[in-house]
């Protein structure tokens, strides 16, 4: 069971300092941006991280949403990342959900975060290059210290 708590607005970057944003096609991509580019591209660069209390504490349970024309929420259905047109729900009556991730700081690096899927244990949000695109994907942690699954989260409130 997950119950919604408070939300915060954040900019998410990978460790190469590329900014996560939502493209016109509602797809999450990373791109090099100056701070001014990041501001100019809002709200596509501003993510709503909603925190949830968890009946089985396993880290900070969160959803990641964006509000452009409508609110869309990040999903990892069958390990394919997409933004689905939906508000983060107030309650989720399950111990796993495609939209719930556990946000944890990387041991020894308090400013670096990782997001583990609640649906797929051991799978993390990651930034990987596929063809020309730096995509947000879901990836199994295959090695300790894998930088692709680490992010910085900068609060914008």
């Amino acid at each position: 069971y997950f119950g919604k708590l408070e939300s915060k607005l954040s900019v998410i970057r990978n460790l190469n300092d590329q900014v996560l944003f939502i493209d016109q096609g509602n797809r999450p991509l990373f791109e090099d941006m100056t701070d001014s580019d990041c501001r100019d591209n809002a709200p596509r660069t501003i993510f709503i991280i909603s925190m949830y209390k968890d009946s089985q504490p396993r880290g900070m349970a969160v959803t990641i949403s964006v509000k452009c024309e409508k609110i869309s929420t990040l999903s990892c259905e069958n390990k394919i990342i997409s933004f689905k047109e939906m508000n983060p729900p107030d309650n989720i009556k399950d111990t796993k959900s495609d939209i719930i991730f556990f946000q944890r700081s990387v041991p020894g690096h308090d400013n670096k975060m990782q997001f583990e899927s609640s649906s797929y244990e051991g799978y993390f949000l990651a930034c990987e290059k596929e063809r020309d695109l730096f995509k947000l994907i879901l990836k199994k942690e295959d090695e300790l210290g894998d930088r692709s699954i680490m992010f910085t989260v900068q609060n914008e409130d």
Partner: antibody, heavy 120, light 108 residues
Framework: QTQLQESGPGLVKPSETLSLTCTVS??????????WGWIRQPPGKGLEWIGS???????YYSPSLKSRVTISVDTSKNQFSLKLSSVTAADTAIYYC????????????WGQGTLVTVSS | EIVLTQSPDTLSLSPGERATLSCRAS???????LAWYQQKPGQAPRLLIY???IRATGIPDRFSGSGSGADFTLTINRLEPEDFAVYYC?????????FGQGTKLEVK
């Protein structure tokens, strides 16, 4: 709704170059999240991916056809093109253009296809 | 390069029956980039399923995809007359795409 339309000669002589163009309407070819692909199907046979292009001009080709294929894009005309050199009868096929979605790398919108026959 | 092998080549069933089509990859897929298409005579292929099991927009729920590793299945419950067609699986890996050779679903 994005639509794709193939155009080009239906008959090409052996050893010559096959040239086709795909015109995209109802959406910009310059979208960040789509690639634009060519797929062919010999009569009565299966689908074969030829290659894909990004609006920036980056290309990705099937290893089996790479030495003979060139795909190019013209963003000002919202078109992309296929050239296949040194054709033989084995290149006779229906040629499809399609939009490839990068979220799961699938071809979600297709042209209706054009039959190209290689014969003297 | 990953090779996809579909079986059977032809499947003969009657309307109302369940069809099970198989697609086997030559190695385990590192990502769930496995899709299924339907093609009817004289038409372009149509995307049915992507990400192994996610139905494309407008696809009826009698179509379902499953599988993991290197073995994947397209199941069509309660076959309708319009479901008789050729079905292809498709995979993306390391910038390249490939299709299986197809399974023809015909009326028994």
């Amino acid at each position: 709704q994005t639509q794709l339309q193939e155009s080009g000669p239906g008959l090409v002589k052996p050893s010559e170059t096959l040239s086709l163009t795909c015109t995209v309407s109802g959406g910009s070819i310059s979208s960040r999240v789509y690639y634009w692909g060519w797929i062919r199907q010999p009569p009565g046979k299966g689908l074969e991916w030829i290659g894909s292009i990004y609006y920036s001009g980056s290309t990705y080709y099937s290893p089996s056809l790479k030495s003979r294929v060139t795909i190019s894009v013209d963003t000002s005309k919202n078109q992309f093109s296929l050239k296949l050199s040194s054709v033989t009868a084995a290149d006779t096929a229906i040629y499809y253009c399609a939009r490839e979605d990068s979220s799961a790398w699938v071809f979600e919108h297709w042209g209706q296809g054009t039959l190209v026959t290689v014969s003297s | 390069e990953i090779v996809l092998t579909q079986s059977p080549d032809t499947l003969s069933l009657s309307p109302g029956e369940r069809a099970t089509l198989s697609c086997r990859a030559s190695q385990i897929l590192s990502r769930n980039y496995l899709a299924w298409y339907q093609q009817k005579p004289g038409q372009a292929p149509r995307l049915l399923i992507y990400g192994i099991s996610i139905r494309a927009t407008g696809i009826p729920d009698r179509f379902s995809g499953s599988g993991s590793g290197a073995d994947f299945t397209l199941t069509i419950n309660r076959l309708e007359p319009e479901d008789f067609a050729v079905y292809y699986c498709q995979h993306y890996d390391n910038s390249l795409c490939s299709f299986g050779q197809g399974t023809k679903l015909e009326v028994k």
